[in-house]
């Protein structure tokens, strides 16, 4: 039926969106190790790359995020 087709299409669109994001995260992780070796771009003491820096920061900060399940940012209304 048309309803079933629409439901299947919606499911597939959601699946593809999730798959794309998963792939982006996976590629990003691979990229991180490559960047760590190159160590170019931003510079600081104790971190091999900017990506390494952010990964460390957000992991350490996760305990505060876990205290607040509402992680969506709030912007000033654009309108």
């Amino acid at each position: 039926s048309e309803a079933e087709d629409a439901s299947l299409l919606s499911f597939m669109q959601g699946y593809m969106k999730h798959a794309t994001k998963t792939a982006k995260d996976a590629l990003s992780s691979v990229q991180e190790s490559q960047v760590a070796q190159q160590a170019r771009g931003w510079v600081t003491d104790g971190f091999s790359s900017l990506k390494d820096y952010w990964s460390t920061v957000k992991d350490k900060f996760s305990e505060f995020w876990d205290l607040d399940p509402e992680v969506r940012p709030t912007s000033a209304v654009a309108a």
Epitope: K24, K51, W54, K60
Partner: antibody, heavy 122, light 108 residues
Framework: QVQLQESGPGLVKPSQTLSLTCTVS??????????WGWIRQSPGKGLDWMAV???????YYSPSLKSRTLISRDTSKNQFSLQLSSVTPEDTAVYYC??????????????WGQGTLVTVSS | QPVLTQPPALSVTLGQTAKITCQGG??????AHWYQQKPGQAPVLVSY???SRPSGIPERFSGSGSGATATLTISGAQAEDEGDYYC???????????FGGGTHLTVL
């Protein structure tokens, strides 16, 4: 509600050091965001990241500015600051302090200060 | 050449749909974020992580990403949507955070 307010001189002479402070109200800089930073906007170069300081005090700098930039924080005053040394007219820009967020990469600026115009001129 | 490329200007008729693009090879592996900036004001986050919208942002703003292109779509553009729009992501090495050159949106 967290708010950011930049403060500092509007005019700086060439070769001097520019010092800016961002005062955060409505939440602690140690617990309300993973990191804070400075971004500047100049007519010729658009928006540029300058430096970032995390909730735990660790810092990161843009490569093009690393040699003359220092970011620091004062948790007792709930402030973080930027120092840019040996300024030239090319450093003339609107300087924004920012609150960073995001569990993915790269992070985004979830909140900006109002911005402060700094002119470098003799 | 900028790491993230945006069209300098775009015009849209009131009530119509505007699509602002941001192109860069790094967008294949890094998320894109979008900011709106009105004259004399600080930028405002209107979309993050490719397609997420901050609370407080009207539903007419939506982001999407496909391959090396990120797109901000404004469905039913309003007069108050006029301004500059910037995309932000990482460069191809992943080791620098960069902004696009900005797109000035005019609502006719």
């Amino acid at each position: 509600q967290v708010q950011l307010q930049e403060s500092g001189p509007g005019l700086v002479k060439p070769s001097q050091t520019l010092s800016l402070t961002c005062t955060v109200s409505g939440g602690s800089i140690s617990t309300t965001a993973p990191a804070w930073g400075w971004i500047r906007q100049s007519p010729g170069k658009g928006l540029d990241w300058m430096a970032v300081i995390a909730f735990d005090g660790s810092a990161y700098y843009s490569p093009s500015l690393k040699s003359r930039t220092l970011i620091s924080r004062d948790t007792s005053k709930n402030q973080f600051s930027l120092q840019l040394s040996s300024v030239t007219p090319e450093d003339t820009a609107v300087y924004y302090c920012a609150r960073l967020g995001g569990r993915n990469y790269p992070p985004y600026v979830e909140l900006w200060g109002q911005g402060t115009l700094v002119t470098v001129s003799s | 050449q900028p790491v993230l490329t945006q069209p300098p200007a775009l015009s849209v008729t009131l009530g119509q749909t505007a699509k602002i693009t941001c192109q860069g090879g790094s967008l294949r592996v890094s998320y894109a974020h979008w900011y709106q900036q009105k004259p004399g004001q600080a930028p405002v986050l209107v979309s993050y992580d490719d397609d997420s919208r901050p609370s407080g942002i009207p539903e007419r703003f939506s982001g999407s990403g496909s391959g090396a292109t990120a797109t901000l779509t404004i469905s039913g553009a309003q007069a108050e949507d006029e301004g500059d729009y910037y995309c932000q992501s990482a460069d191809s090495s992943g080791d620098n955070w960069v902004f696009g050159g900005g797109t000035h949106l005019t609502v006719l």
